[in-house]
Interface confidence: medium
């Protein structure tokens, strides 16, 4: 760029001089250098202006990207407060059931235990009844009326 | 820095020159000025170009991380929507097992009652096998054959 | 801005000259833009180096709320991972509540089937109670005793 | 933790009856609770058995129609009345959760005398 | 009923050393479903009966494993690895598998 171009020309004026005037060379030279440094300077300003308004229009576009991911990220820190709470309800419906099982678990048993001193209970009249059974006579006649009929006859 | 330093040098200029001719003094003053000035905008152009290079280096790297945030906080989002649908589910499924607990509990009152019928019916059964028990004859021998063998004898 | 003014006066200086010394005015327009050029640098420098400054500043609001927005998704990911194992864990007590009601459904049938037998068997008894009921004697003395009675009157 | 806690000792006249309460405490529904009683320096002997959750009873030969077992669900406290008492039925009256006895009361002392 | 009968009846043994009470049945203990309904208690002095052992050979909670039950059938046994002070009182085998339940007569456990 113009503005890089070191300006050591500058130094070049007379550096012996004879005169206490000043060349019309040396001022043009002199002019030359202020009409390029004008002109880089200018460039530069140009160019600074439209990079940093550039940066600005980056970070406004920055800005808004951030405040809607932000909002988004409120929003999923929001619906999993949500979905926490949701899961909690479901552990505490779970645990309901839980015990709902347990307790119906626990009827179950105690009805099993019934069964079984009811099943026992029938085992026992069985075995009385069988045992009546097997006492009743075989025959319709009883021995001591046979011979009976025996010492009479 | 040298840009910060006043020109205000310039103005001492042959303030009331007599001759039409500059001084080479005041055309080296010039010189010096603009070499100064050359300079200070040589520094500070490329201090600047440096700072913005940063600032668009920087603006990159953010540009490349707000891009992953955005990709992970979608990932969350869509993760938490999987969430929210197994979570869904869950509830289905915690109702499901929850009604299931309740049909177990209606057929468990309903065999109770069938249980306590039965038991019941067991009980009515031991009363008429002990009543039966009891009308049973003590002895093997019947009175009416004894009171017979005696009138007979 | 001053800097924005061509400096193209330079150009007038002198182009056919009759002499070899500057001039003196020619020198003044020669300080004069040196004077501007200087004045708009240094305004531009200072209104760079505040832009420039606020960029920073900005960007360094921004990398702050950055780290945080990144915090809060790292937590949220957290956070979302920890309500995944809740989730599976729930899960798995929900199997394992179904698992039980299937089991206590199962031992419910089981016990059903038990009670029909059961309820078989009570009936079985009860036919045989009635059957030893019906085969007793209707009256204390028995039909052989009568006939043995007649036969020795 | 499963507790069973009786009413306090009794005094009765031959011919009298006596009921003995037995309150449940600590676990989960419905169980059977079974009556056991021991004579002064005597073994064990069954007696019979109530559901807590059916009031369903049941109770050995020996004291079929003198023993009545009742249940108050309210309260989760059992009760056993034994009627037409006799010197002999001097003793100690427990209660035991289940159909196998797995927890026991502290027992209430029954004094038959004239 | 079904008759159960322990012995011996009174059981003298030195601390640390092992003890065993045997229990018989009139009739076999085995129920239709398969399990033997066989109890163990211990009562000691002046408490309430506190079950050891059911179902022939499971340890309630709490019970020291000290204290283990055998047997099948007709035939069981209780037995202390070593009897310990706190072992001291009577112990009853029970059986729940016939209607009505019954008990045996007790073993009274002392030191020597």
């Known amino acids: 760029s113009r503005i890089d171009q070191d300006n050591s020309s500058f130094d070049s004026l007379s550096p012996e001089p004879k005169s206490r005037f000043a060349m019309l060379d040396d001022v043009k030279i002199l002019a030359n250098g202020l009409l390029q440094l004008g002109h880089g300077l200018k460039d530069f300003v140009h160019k600074t202006k439209g990079q940093i308004n550039d940066i600005f229009q980056k970070l406004n576009i920055f800005d808004q990207s951030f405040y809607d991911l932000s909002l988004q990220t409120s929003e999923i820190k929001e619906e999993e407060k949500e979905l926490r709470r949701t899961t909690y309800k479901l552990q505490v419906k779970n645990e309901e059931v839980k015990n709902m099982s347990l307790e119906l678990n626990s009827k179950l048993e105690s009805l099993l235990e019934e069964k079984i001193l009811l099943q026992q209970k029938v085992k026992y009249l069985e075995e009385q009844l069988t045992n009546l059974i097997q006492n009743q006579p075989e025959t319709p006649e009883h021995p001591e009326v046979t011979s009976l009929k025996t010492f009479v006859e | 820095s040298r840009i910060d330093q006043d020109n205000s040098s310039f103005d001492s200029l042959s303030p009331e020159p007599k001759s039409r001719f500059a001084m080479l003094d005041d055309v080296k003053i010039l010189a010096n000025g603009l070499l100064q000035l050359g300079h200070g905008l040589k520094d500070f152009v490329h201090k600047t170009k440096g700072q913005i290079n940063d600032i668009f280096q920087k603006l990159n790297i953010f540009d490349q991380s707000f891009y992953d945030l955005s990709l992970q906080t979608s990932e969350i989002k869509e993760e938490e929507k999987e969430l929210r649908r197994t979570t869904y589910k869950l509830q289905v499924k915690n109702e499901e097992v929850k009604n299931m607990s309740l049909e177990l509990n209606s057929k468990l009152e309903s065999l109770l009652e069938e249980k306590i019928l039965l038991q019941q019916k067991v009980k009515y059964l031991e009363e008429q096998l002990t009543n039966l028990i009891q009308n049973q004859p003590e002895t093997p021998e019947h009175p009416e054959v004894t009171s017979l063998k005696t009138f007979v004898e | 801005s001053r800097i924005d003014q061509d400096n193209s006066s330079f150009d007038s200086l002198s182009p056919e000259p009759k002499s070899r010394f500057a001039m003196l005015d020619d020198v003044k327009i020669l300080a004069n833009g040196l004077l501007q050029l200087g004045h708009g640098l240094k305004d531009f420098v200072h209104k760079t180096k505040g832009q420039i400054n606020d960029i920073f500043q900005k960007l360094n609001i921004f990398d702050q709320s950055f780290y945080d927005l990144s915090l809060q998704t790292s937590e949220i990911k957290e956070e979302e991972k920890e309500l995944r194992r809740t989730t599976y864990k729930l899960q798995v007590k929900n199997e394992e509540v179904k698992n039980m009601s299937l089991e206590l459904n199962s031992k419910l049938e089981s016990l059903l089937e038990e009670k029909i037998l059961l309820q078989q068997k009570v009936k079985y008894l009860e036919e045989q109670l009635t059957n030893l009921i019906q085969n007793q004697p209707e009256t204390p003395e028995h039909p052989e005793v009568t006939s043995l009675k007649t036969f020795v009157e | 933790q499963v507790q069973l806690v009786q009413s306090g000792p009794e005094v009765k006249k031959p011919g009298a009856s006596v009921r003995v309460s037995c309150k449940a405490s600590?676990?989960?529904?419905?169980?059977?609770i079974t009556w056991v009683r021991q004579a002064p320096g005597q073994g064990l002997e069954w007696m019979g058995w109530i559901s807590t959750y059916s009031g369903d009873t049941d109770s050995a030969p020996k004291f079929q129609g003198r023993v009545t077992m009742t249940t108050d669900t309210s309260t989760t406290t059992v009760f056993l009345e034994l009627r037409s008492l006799r010197s002999d039925d001097t003793a100690v009256y427990y209660c035991?959760?289940?159909?196998?006895?797995?927890?026991w009361g502290q027992g209430t002392l029954v004094t038959v005398s004239s | 009923d079904v008759v159960m009968t322990q012995s011996p009846l009174s059981l003298p043994v030195t601390l640390g050393q092992p003890a065993s009470i045997s229990c018989r049945s009139s009739?076999?203990?085995?129920?239709?479903?398969?399990?033997?309904?066989l109890n163990w208690f211990q009562q000691r002095p002046g408490q309430s009966p506190r079950r050891l052992i059911y179902?022939?050979?499971n340890r309630d909670s709490g019970v020291p494993d000290r204290f283990s039950g055998s047997g099948s059938g007709t035939d069981f046994t209780l037995k202390i690895s070593r009897v310990e002070a706190e072992d001291v009182g009577v112990y009853y085998c029970m059986q729940g598998t016939h209607w009505p339940y019954t008990f045996g007569q007790g073993t009274k456990l002392e030191i020597k």
């Open positions: 600590g676990y989960l529904s419905d169980f059977i």
């Open positions: 009739q076999s203990l085995v129920y239709s479903d398969g399990n033997t309904y």
């Open positions: 035991a959760r289940g159909r196998l006895f797995d927890y």
């Open positions: 179902k022939v050979s």
